[in-house]
Interface confidence: medium
Amino acid sequence: IWELKKDVYVVELDWYPDAPGEMVVLTCDTPEEDGITWTLDQSSEVLGSGKTLTIQVKEFGDAGQYTCHKGGEVLSHSLLLLHKKEDGIWSTDILKDQKEPKNKTFLRCEAKNYSGRFTCWWLTTISTDLTFSVKSSRGSSDPQGVTCGAATLSAERVRGDNKEYEYSVECQEDSACPAAEESLPIEVMVDAVHKLKYENYTSSFFIRDIIKPDPPKNLQLKPLKNSRQVEVSWEYPDTWSTPHSYFSLTFCVQVQGKSKREKKDRVFTDKTSATVICRKNASISVRAQDRYYSSSWSEWASVPCS
Amino acid sequence: RAVPGGSSPAWTQCQQLSQKLCTLAWSAHPLVGHMDLREEGDEETTNDVPHIQCGDGCDPQGLRDNSQFCLQRIHQGLIFYEKLLGSDIFTGEPSLLPDSPVAQLHASLLGLSQLLQPEGHHWETQQIPSLSPSQPWQRLLLRFKILRSLQAFVAVAARVFAHGAATLSP
């Protein structure tokens, strides 16, 4: 058993049929010695008396808010949550496996630049009685500070018969060094509590590996005289690290016909313009990627040819 | 070339070669052996690999003030990785093809380090770890990790040379 926060405790249980459970001793936070009784949740049934209460925690029915009283007055509370371990593996019932980039990916994180700011998100089908707490650091043995905000519900989607809820959190490294080569990974830890179930999820990454630039901005076409060719130009996204002579991007320009089956013409360039042939009813799209490190491409910025 | 007294390197040549190094480091990575390695979390234990750190002056302001600190750090790293790529870790079984990206990467690391340091001028180089002949599992693991680490190192080096070519070239 360990303390998650004041008056909230997590009991770690091996979860299998007829498991012995854990013996837990609760102590009433009071100078009083006599006439103390214990109850669980809203029940008025007295579970025991005395300054301490010893219970055998085996299942969710044994978890909840234990309260010690004296003469009708509440003295203190202890909320017991359960953390299940089945076949040696901690349960992951609360969050959905996003399966990208690999199985057992519950947390996904992205950064728009090298400033040390990043966003993580996760999915769940649970709509109520759900709380999240996020902590982060650079490295784990001698951790350096990363400050995370509160997790917020960022999207709701309908998937078949189910509703899916996306939560996200923004974090910022306290002393970021955008130009340095990272040697210690960022660690992100999410505590999830659903009713009386506790779970924790972690992710470890380098900012360089989660970079995904915003799409190029101000995408424009300039027809070239007496030609089917057009000059496409664009600019670096505002959110990308500066100076651009140091934090450079590379770009992919694509000409795509109306039909998905039509052949795509692609050009790769380090410049912020390119000359392409504009077909009727086609569209021109441009996306960006770090020039020197193969992290994710941005989403496409697009304009129609006409 | 970076010479004693701190004159400038051939920024544009360094930029071109460092960008080529980035491409090679990424094309070499999947080809380091029959990789069925589980993608492990990135450990905190790359203790013997030189990193370009915050105080090394490789940021735009540091380059403007005095690029020599940063260039020396990059040179150390290039020599370190060049030695590793020429070691038993990459030459032993399972063997790589002679024209593999690793061989080109090895040659390019050497080329860039020579551009940075002409004859007769010697910066201190970091001690290269000496590893006894290793088994294939050890080589495969090390190749994978070394190339991952090299990708990060050459990305920073390439940014330095791109910025230098754009802003510090005579």
């Epitope: - | 052996g33 029959h34 990789m35 069925d36 390695l37 492990e40 450990e43 905190e44 234990t45 790359t46 203790n47 013997d48 690999v49 079984e93 399972p94 770890p129 000496s130 590893l131 006894s132 002949p133 290793s134 088994q135 294939p136 599992w137 050890q138 495969l140 693991l141 090390l142 990790k145």
Partner: antibody, heavy 117, light 108 residues
Framework: QVQLVQSGAEVKKPGSSVKVSCKAS????????ISWVRQAPGQGLEWMGG????????NYAQKFQGRVTITADESTSTAYMELSSLRSEDTAVYYC??????????WGQGTLVTVSS | DIVLTQSPATLSLSPGERATLSCRAS???????LAWYQQKPGQAPRLLIY???SRATGVPARFSGSGSGTDFTLTISSLEPEDFAVYYC?????????FGQGTKVEIK
């Protein structure tokens, strides 16, 4: 002459963890890898994983992935193997061995780990 | 992972006889990175052969290894009383090392 000396026998409860140490003497610890092999009573040898202390890089058998952590402390020339979420089937003798190009040429004396409620 | 199958499971022989132990791999063992170990009750294994055919330091000449690809053999030319033990083959050509299930050489 390299020698590997392991920590003593352990009795553990199901669900708990065990950490076995393996101290090397008489050679350059960093210059080779250390593998961990276990042997259940009356059974054969089973490779669990290995570490290259110089780099701190570990490689694990698929079967133990996520449950075993192999580490090394160069300053004390000691390798460690921690196995979590123990079950009765983990009762075995755990060996560390120096793992070089010629196979596992030097072995520790073995550590018996008994998992019992 | 490469699966190693040893045969026979038990070999009953008398001192002075020749012992031939087989180890078959489910896929080719790259570079013949195959080792043989001897283990006596209550003791740690001892390396006998590495690289399929090279004898480890201090191993008597009566032990020899041969084979390549997927089929490997350990031969004990003339069994001594101290040779009665369990023998394991192990491949180390792959990112995951594996052992065979062992062959017990017992006194007939």
């Amino acid at each position: 002459q390299v020698q590997l000396v392991q920590s003593g026998a352990e009795v553990k409860k199901p669900g708990s963890s065990v950490k076995v140490s393996c101290k090397a003497s008489g050679g350059t610890f960093s210059n080779y890898a250390i593998s961990w092999v276990r042997q259940a009573p009356g059974q054969g040898l089973e490779w669990m994983g290995g570490i290259i202390p110089m780099f701190g890089y570990a490689n694990y058998a698929q079967k133990f992935q996520g449950r075993v952590t192999i580490t090394a402390d160069e300053s004390t020339s000691t390798a460690y193997m921690e196995l979590s979420s123990l079950r009765s089937e983990d009762t075995a003798v755990y060996y560390c061995a120096r793992d070089i190009y010629a196979g596992m040429d030097v072995w520790g004396q073995g550590t018996l780990v008994t998992v019992s409620s | 992972d490469i699966v190693l199958t040893q045969s026979p499971a038990t070999l009953s022989l008398s001192p002075g006889e020749r012992a031939t132990l087989s180890c078959r791999a489910s896929q080719s063992v790259l570079g013949n990175y195959l080792a043989w170990y001897q283990q006596k009750p209550g003791q740690a294994p001892r390396l006998l052969i590495y690289g399929a055919s090279s004898r480890a330091t201090g191993v008597p000449a009566r032990f020899s290894g041969s084979g390549s690809g997927t089929d490997f053999t350990l031969t004990i030319s003339s069994l001594e009383p101290e040779d009665f033990a369990v023998y394991y083959c192990q491949q180390y050509s792959h990112i995951s090392l594996t052992f065979g299930q062992g062959t017990k050489v017992e006194i007939k």
